[in-house]
């Protein structure tokens, strides 16, 4: 058993048929000695009396908020949560496996630049009685500070018969140098509590590996005289690290017809303009990627040819 | 520690070209190592990230763009630095700063070159003949060093008398390639910045 936060404790349980469970001794936080009674989860039924209460925790129903009282007055609370281990593996029932970039990916993170700011998100089908708390650091043995906000519900989607909920959190490394060469990864730890179930999820990454620039901005077309060609121009996204001559991007320009089956013409360039042939009903799209370190491409910025 | 905007130096352009070749070569070599040594811990997640130049050179700080010198986190990111005199930042001694930066890059290349050559000599003794260093990568390191045109003492190639442990050597190769790729990215950024200045 360990303390998650004040008055909240996690009981780690090996889960198998006929498991003996864990004996937990709760102590009422009071100088009083006599006349103390214990109840569970808002029920008035008395479970026992005395300054301590010993319980055998075997399953979820044995957890909950234990309260000690004296003469109708609440003295203290202890909320017990369960962390379930089956066949040596901690449960991962609360979050959905996103399977990208590999199996058992529960947390996904992205950064728009090298400032040390990043966003992580996760998915669940659970809609109620759910809380998350997020901690992060650079390195684990001698951790350096990363500050994370509160996790918030950022999207809801319908997937078949199920509703899926996306939560996200923003974190910022306390003292980040955009030009630094990372040797210690960022560690992100998410505590998830659903009803009386506790689970934790972790992700470890270098900012350089989770970079995904915003799409190029101010995408414009300039027709060239007496030609089907157009000059496409764009700018670096505002969120990208500066100076741009140091943090350079490379771009992919794509001409795509109305039908998805039509052949796509693609051009790669380090410049912020390109000359392409504009077909009728086609659209021109541009995306960006770090020029020197191949992490993710940005989403496309698009304009119609007409 | 910083790179103020300088008047274009025609000598920079070959360096930019060579640094791009370097990044391409080290990236290809790393990809080849990851594929060939698929049953060894050779991915970014599996290896320890070591920097053989740590406390010996200070490329990130010496080559910091002027725009980032206002960021205290960039100035404090390492104990060792070429510039301890703060007035250098204020006086904007461009050529002096650039010389420090480029000599730091040169020292990096020299250290990696020695490590890679020593390692290749060991790998050539491996009866499995599983992996060797790409001669193109070694050549590109040499070309960039020549383009940087610094004269410094030749570092003798490390020779070892004991029987090489090929498993350890291959893991060390992965560690070295990962670190060198990260340094090659920094070098490319620096050359691009200098080229644009």
């Amino acid at each position: 058993i360990w303390e998650l936060k004040k008055d909240v404790y996690v009981v780690e349980l090996d889960w198998y048929p006929d498991a003996p469970g864990e004996m937990v001794v709760l102590t009422c936080d009071t100088p009083e000695e006599d006349g103390i009674t214990w109840t569970l989860d808002q029920s008035s039924e008395v479970l026992g009396s005395g300054k301590t209460l010993t319980i055998q925790v075997k399953e979820f129903g044995d957890a909950g908020q234990y309260t000690c009282h004296k003469g109708g007055e609440v003295l203290s609370h202890s909320l017990l949560l369960l962390h379930k281990k089956e066949d040596g593996i901690w449960s991962t029932d609360i979050l959905k496996d996103q399977k990208e970039p590999k199996n058992k990916t529960f947390l996904r993170c992205e950064a728009k630049n090298y400032s040390g700011r990043f966003t992580c998100w996760w998915l669940t089908t659970i809609s109620t009685d759910l809380t998350f708390s997020v901690k992060s650091s650079r390195g684990s043995s001698d951790p350096q500070g990363v500050t994370c906000g509160a996790a918030t519900l950022s999207a809801e989607r319908v997937r078949g018969d199920n509703k899926e909920y996306e939560y996200s959190v923003e974190c910022q490394e306390d003292s980040a140098c955009p030009a630094a060469e990372e040797s210690l990864p960022i560690e992100v730890m998410v505590d998830a509590v659903h009803k009386l179930k506790y689970e934790n999820y972790t992700s470890s990454f270098f900012i350089r590996d989770i970079i995904k620039p915003d799409p190029p901005k101010n995408l414009q077309l300039k027709p060239l005289k007496n030609s089907r060609q157009v000059e496409v121009s764009w700018e670096y996204p505002d969120t990208w690290s500066t100076p741009h001559s140091y943090f350079s991007l490379t771009f992919c320009v794509q001409v795509q017809g109305k039908s998805k089956r039509e052949k796509k013409d693609r051009v790669f360039t380090d410049k912020t303009s390109a000359t392409v042939i504009c077909r009728k009903n086609a659209s021109i799209s541009v995306r960006a990627q770090d020029r020197y370190y191949s992490s993710s491409w940005s989403e496309w910025a698009s304009v119609p040819c007409s | 520690r910083n790179l103020p905007v300088a008047t274009p130096d025609p000598g920079m352009f070959p360096c930019l070209h060579h640094s791009q070749n370097l990044l391409r070569a080290v990236s290809n070599m790393l990809q080849k190592a990851r594929q060939t040594l698929e049953f060894y811990p050779c991915t970014s997640e599996e290896i320890d990230h070591e920097d053989i130049t740590k406390d010996k050179t200070s490329t990130v700080e010496a080559c910091l763009p002027l725009e980032l010198t206002k960021n205290e986190s960039c100035l404090n990111s390492r104990e060792t630095s070429f510039i301890t005199n703060g007035s250098c930042l204020a006086s904007r001694k461009t050529s002096f700063m650039m010389a420090l930066c480029l000599s730091s890059i040169y020292e990096d290349l020299k250290m990696y070159q020695v490590e890679f050559k020593t390692m290749n000599a060991k790998l050539l003794m491996d009866p499995k003949r599983q992996i060797f260093l790409d001669q193109n990568m070694l050549a590109v390191i040499d070309e960039l060093m020549q383009a940087l045109n610094f004269n410094s003492e030749t570092v003798p190639q490390k020779s070892s008398l004991e029987e090489p442990d090929f498993y350890k050597t291959k893991i060390k190769l992965c560690i070295l390639l990962h670190a060198f790729r990260i340094r090659a990215v920094t070098i490319d950024r620096v050359m691009s910045y200098l080229n644009a200045s």
Epitope: D41, G61, D62 | -
Partner: nanobody
């Protein structure tokens, strides 16, 4: 999902005893409490006994206290209701139920899963 199957109901004389069993299957580890409720035609379902978890707490209404005992065999995922000193007013359909809710474990409206029910008739 949790599936519940009751057994052990029947006809018994007043003052007699019966033991009801409820076998649970499926995602039983999600359940917080299991209980027995009864219903007489035309009346609301009534709480009879609830066991919380593996037995940290048991709840009974005054009408059955001292006569009925709820217990659980966690290994077999089975809940039992031992009914002694039965009275004609105990005649009803007895339902086994399971809840994933922490609170109001004596309120049948908070229960997620129900068995099909077993008839208990007490003759005088």
């Amino acid at each position: 999902q949790v599936q519940l199957v009751e057994s052990g109901g029947g006809l018994v004389q007043a003052g007699g005893s019966l033991r009801l069993s409820c076998a649970a299957s499926g995602r039983t580890f999600e359940t917080i409490a299991m209980g027995w409720f009864r219903q007489v035609p035309g009346k609301e379902r009534e709480f009879v006994a609830v066991i919380r978890g593996s037995g940290v707490a048991t709840y009974y209404p005054d009408s059955v206290k001292g006569r009925f005992t709820i217990s659980k065999d966690s290994a077999k995922n089975t809940v039992y209701l031992q009914m002694n000193n039965l009275k004609p007013e105990d005649t009803a359909v007895y339902y086994c139920a399971a809840t994933t809710n922490r609170f109001k474990n004596t309120d049948y409206t908070t229960y997620d899963y129900w068995g099909q029910g077993t008839q208990v008739t007490v003759s005088s």
